[in-house]
């Protein structure tokens, strides 16, 4: 799996999971979560050739249409594939309130 | 939605459906298919800037964060969301067969 | 049900030459593609070469060292390779889809030495 078991460990040109760490204030100017600070977001980034981690028919024969065609621009794209929730903690007014936020943390990628 | 009635009628940079056409024997090397000769597989590209088509949460968290820090390089992608099968029929020695593959041609993009 | 058989790795030097062998057995109809791909330890499983029935296609660190070829009537697949490099070491893997589904063999070890 293009996980961070394996993409953190290796150098890695093609798709694969990046490290991405975002500070809800800095960087998303949101001031209204109160914990956590900021999370490992990660994200996907990366070549998808020659088959690498097709996903699905259409992006297997879109990557053998690319092989075969090294020429061409439609080539399948590095997204994420398993994501997980993030859990927030934050008032209104005087009263704490916990949410879970689906679909926040990228876990893995494919090439679709 | 980002389908052929909407990108196909419009010149758009952004994430969109693209026309592509695969000949299965002169994009593919594929001589065994009988019928058809080829078919629309269609394919994703195009921009994903600020919500453009947000898939999930994090596509939307990285979307922002891009905005914010437009130096990132951690931008969402343009990749298929809705996938149709396509009916064949090839043979085996002197027997037709008809054969329905899944998820060969693209009807619609998204930013995830 | 496919199964697929592969053969001819071993020990090389750099600069030497093998010739890998797989052997596919069962009903082979709906060929998407017939190729080889290599896994190094700890790597992820990358394409080395594919072949479809009138089109080859080579990842790019072994074009014109390695040569894949295909004998459909003895349903046979092959890969010659020529000037190996540390760098080719990995158990090799033959792959054949069909239809869609990803048929592999059980792999042989490719070590470039010296």
């Known amino acids: 799996a293009l996980d961070a078991a394996y993409c953190f460990r290796n150098v890695q040109d093609n798709c694969c999971l990046r490290p991405l760490y975002i500070d809800f204030k800095r960087d998303l100017g949101w001031k209204w979560i109160h914990e956590p600070k900021g999370y490992n977001a990660n994200f996907c980034a990366g070549a998808c050739p020659y088959l690498w981690s097709s996903d699905t028919q259409h992006s297997r024969v879109l990557s053998l249409y690319n092989t075969i065609n090294p020429e061409a621009s439609a080539s399948p794209c590095c997204v994420s594939q398993d994501l997980e929730p993030l859990t927030i903690l934050y008032y209104i007014g005087k009263t704490p309130k916990i949410e879970q936020l689906s679909n926040m943390i990228v876990k893995s990628c494919k090439c679709s | 939605a980002l389908d052929a009635a909407y990108c196909f009628r419009n010149v758009q940079d952004n994430c969109c459906l693209r026309p592509l056409y695969i000949d299965f024997k002169r994009d593919l090397g594929w001589k065994w298919i009988h019928e058809p000769k080829g078919y629309n597989a269609n394919f994703c590209a195009g921009a994903c800037p600020y919500l453009w088509s947000s898939d999930t949460q994090h596509s939307r968290v990285l979307s922002l964060y891009n905005t914010i820090n437009p130096e990132a390089s951690a931008s969402p992608c343009c990749v298929s969301q809705d996938l149709e099968p396509l009916t064949i029929l090839y043979y085996i020695g002197k027997t037709p067969k008809i054969e329905q593959l899944s998820n060969m041609i693209v009807k619609s993009c998204k930013c995830s | 049900q496919v199964q697929l058989v592969e053969s001819g790795g071993g020990l090389v030097q750099p600069g030497g030459s093998l010739r890998l062998s797989c052997a596919a057995s069962g009903s082979i109809f709906g060929v998407f593609y017939m190729g080889w791909f290599r896994q190094a330890p700890g790597k992820q499983r990358e394409m080395v070469a594919i072949s479809t029935d009138d089109r080859t296609s080579y990842v790019d660190s072994v074009k014109g060292r390695f040569t894949i070829s295909r004998d459909n009537a003895k349903n046979t697949l092959a890969l010659q390779m020529n000037s190996l490099k540390p760098e080719d070491t990995a158990v090799y893997f033959c792959?054949?889809?069909?239809?869609?589904?990803?048929?592999w063999g059980p792999g042989t070890q490719v070590t470039v030495s010296s």
């Open positions: 792959n054949l889809n069909q239809l869609g589904t990803d048929y």
